[in-house]
């Protein structure tokens, strides 16, 4: 899978002589609108209410450590995370839930109740969504928390469970 | 809270002359790009099916005016609403719908149906999102409906009801 | 609604000379910050687990053609899909799953199961959306399955099925 | 080292005005929200106002809602209470907070860094 | 306005204690709460930020927990210099607000 790298800062970026010298479509390319963005899917073994993901997945002008995806340009982003549950439901209802959070702050959560008929089913299936448009500070870490991390269906559908971020619009 | 106001039209950009002079990378930060978002919690009380927001929020380049976003700078705008409802069932089925309307028009809905079983339970949480992309005039409203408007979690999940709008592609 | 034709390739764009000669506003606003996106709602009338759109909606730099969006520009798009399901409940609980494919390959699922209770009642619904974050080359296409296409609510709400792309980041 | 200096105290008659400073220093000031706490002898915390790091999202407390103003000048590194119309029950030990967030949305994170605090008695 | 009700407003414990104070918000905050302490004649001092994240320098004998509203603050082994007042404080809206405080007072 794709792993990028963020070029020179535009304050770096040498618009006047070098190559591109007075062309303007070479100028414009280099130009300072910087984009940054992650799409990361959940790691196959989880085994605590932080998830983890696999680190192979895209990542441009955003770090992943521990479980954390780390924010390398301030501005603001679009977070986006889904994930898809299978529930062997048990005699009673289940609340799924599932927790954005910045630098350990909860900001958003979604919860879902299921096998609420209070019957042993064979199976459950439920997805579950959350987004959030935040401003992000350079260093921001942005983590997942699902209290009901063995209910996350990692082996039947293991690209369904992503943490996706990006740039909508710098801090320039 | 934060309410940005958007800088001149970029018909007003001094692109040449000022301080910018030749600086090309001056004239690119302050070329025509423009970006509008808006990013706003739902009221804390709810007493009709028109939702009210909280005009503290995220507003850039959008007003906020009697439940409705008024957009200021016609373009593409991808449009998401997402709600967090808890439904204490009584003794039949529920169905949670979420409107959002264009011009006091329906332009999209999401239904879900809760409480399925027909069993009076303690409490069942289910989240609602709908999203739109549409080109929006100057004075566009952008509104939400909610018939079900008492089965809205405010108090346990104030964060977690939300109105965002943001520019994908301004019109010119 | 609205279909839009894609200007010339931005290598043919004239930044020296022309009309545009010296103007830098003008020649901002032909800069090669390409956008390419689609919304599409579902066709009235489904028959296949393959669904198909209706090509009158919004189309930028993407066609459609037999059920497939085709991308025009290569680049990390951002696609999501949306449907509303209306379940006349057997006496079994239904899994409704939506697809995303890309290149016919499957690249995301979301999967809720409905009707749990088992018991018949008049009607469930159900919303269930998608969405990925994936770098597209050209001629790429992108489509929907649905196995149980003839829960999809085509009549009741015409306007909820949907199918949208975007384009995030060029490859430039 | 992270420091907040607070100025501006002292002893005025109810119905006057003060202007409270705070001097920061040791971290970037204009990327985090700042707060201002006060405490009455003998008495808890009380939260007085906060503002974003860009000014754009500011907050009071009910108590103090129309006659105190918070400002900040991110050149000089400097946070302000503006004190109009005191009351005796304005009384108290003025703090000046630095918060972990930017205030934006609501991003507040809790505080991190205390000044020592400057004290204000409202008395005829 | 959002309550903060601490409990209980002072207890007296020995060195060596085990000591838990609780702290609950009249309407859910998430994890959106910070504990702090503070001696007399000072400024009080940050110890604990996200109802459980340890502020850098505090030590691992103060933990935070809790999610919603409820929530506890607990110093597993009290030491002489933890005798103090603690108050919690939220700040997920305005207007922030604060425990009335718990007085910890040598036995």
């Known amino acids: 899978q794709r792993t990028d790298s963020i070029p020179n800062s535009p304050d770096n970026i040498p618009l006047r002589g070098g190559n591109c010298s007075e062309d303007l479509l070479c100028i414009l390319k280099r130009a300072p609108f910087k984009k940054s963005w992650a799409y990361l899917q959940v790691a196959k073994h989880l085994n605590k209410t932080k998830l983890s993901w696999n680190k192979d997945g895209i990542l441009h002008g955003v770090r992943y450590q521990d479980g954390n995806l780390v924010i390398q340009f301030p501005g603001l982003y679009f977070i986006i995370c889904q994930l898809q549950f299978l529930v062997q439901c048990p005699n009673n209802s289940v609340d799924l839930k599932l927790e954005l959070l910045i630098n350990k702050h909860i900001k958003k959560q979604a919860l879902v109740t299921v096998c609420e008929s209070g019957m042993q089913t064979k199976h459950v299936y439920q997805n579950l969504s959350q987004f959030l448009l935040d401003y992000l500070q350079v260093n921001t870490t942005v983590s997942v928390n699902v209290d009901t991390f063995q209910y996350i269906d990692t082996s039947t559908f293991p690209l369904e469970n992503v943490l996706s971020v990006f740039l909508y619009s710098n801090s320039d | 809270q934060r309410t940005d106001s958007i800088p001149n039209s970029p018909d007003n950009i001094p692109l040449r002359g000022g301080n910018c002079s030749e600086d090309l990378l001056c004239i690119l930060k302050r070329a025509p790009f423009k970006k509008s978002w808006a990013y706003l919690q739902v009221a804390k009380h709810l007493n009709k099916t028109k939702l009210s927001w909280n005009k503290d929020g995220i507003l850039h380049g959008v007003r906020y005016q009697d439940g409705n976003l008024v957009i200021q700078f016609p373009g593409l705008y991808f449009i998401i609403c997402q709600l967090q409802f808890l439904v204490q069932c009584p003794n039949n089925s529920v169905d949670l719908k979420l409107e959002l309307l264009i011009n006091k028009h329906i332009k999209k809905q999401a239904l879900v149906t809760v409480c399925e079983s027909g069993m009076q339970t303690k409490h069942v949480y289910q989240n609602l999102s709908q999203f739109l992309l549409d080109y929006l005039q100057v004075n566009t409203t952008v509104s939400v409906n909610v018939d079900t408007f008492q089965y809205i979690d405010t108090s346990t999940f104030p964060l977690e009801n939300v109105l965002s709008v943001f520019l994908y592609s301004n019109s010119d | 609604q609205r279909t839009d034709s894609i200007p010339n390739s931005p290598d043919n764009i004239p930044l020296r000379g022309g009309n545009c000669s010296e103007d830098l506003l003008c020649i901002l606003k032909r800069a090669p910050f390409k956008k390419s996106w689609a919304y599409l709602q579902v066709a009235k009338h489904l028959n296949k687990t393959k669904l198909s759109w209706n090509k009158d909606g919004i189309l930028h730099g993407v066609r459609y053609q037999d059920g497939n969006l085709v991308i025009q520009f290569p680049g990390l798009y951002f696609i999501i899909c949306q449907l509303q399901f209306l379940v006349q409940c057997p006496n079994n609980s239904v899994d409704l799953k939506l697809e995303l494919l890309i290149n016919k390959h499957i690249k995301k699922q979301a999967l809720v199961t409905v009707c749990e209770s088992g018991m018949q009642t008049k009607h469930v619904y159900q919303n269930l959306s998608q969405f990925l974050l994936d770098y597209l080359q050209v001629n790429t296409t992108v489509s929907v399955n649905v196995d149980t296409f003839q829960y999809i609510d085509t009549s009741t709400f015409p306007l909820e099925n949907v199918l949208s792309v975007f384009l995030y980041s060029n490859s430039d | 080292e992270v420091q907040l200096v607070e100025s501006g105290g002292g002893l005025v008659q109810p119905g006057r005005s003060l202007r409270l400073s705070c001097a920061a220093s040791g971290f970037n000031f204009d990327d985090y929200a700042m707060h201002w706490v006060r405490q009455a002898p003998g008495k808890g915390l009380e939260w007085v106002s906060g503002i974003s790091w860009r000014s754009g999202n500011i907050g009071y407390a009910g108590s103090v809602k129309g006659r105190f103003t918070i400002s900040r000048d991110n050149a000089k590194n400097s946070l302000y209470l503006q004190m109009n119309s005191l009351r005796p029950e304005d009384s108290a030990l003025y703090y000046c907070?630095?918060?972990?967030?930017?205030?934006?949305?609501?991003?507040?994170?809790?505080?991190?860094?205390w000044g020592q605090g400057t004290l204000v008695t409202v008395s005829s | 306005d959002i309550q903060m009700t601490q409990s209980p407003s002072s207890l007296s414990a020995s060195v060596g204690d085990r000591v838990t104070i609780t702290c609950r918000a009249s309407?859910?905050?998430?994890?959106?709460l910070a504990w702090f302490q503070q001696k007399p004649g000072k400024a009080p001092k940050s110890l604990i930020y996200a109802a459980s994240s340890l502020q850098s320098g505090v030590p691992s004998k103060f933990s935070g927990s809790g999610s919603g509203t409820d929530f506890t603050l607990t110093i597993s082994s009290l030491q002489p210099e933890d005798f103090a007042t603690y108050y919690c404080q939220q700040y997920v809206t305005y207007p922030l607000t604060f425990g009335g405080g718990t007085k910890v007072e040598i036995k």
């Open positions: 309407q859910g905050i998430s994890n959106h």
């Open positions: 907070a630095k918060d972990k967030g930017i205030g934006f949305n609501w991003n507040y994170e809790g505080f991190d860094y």
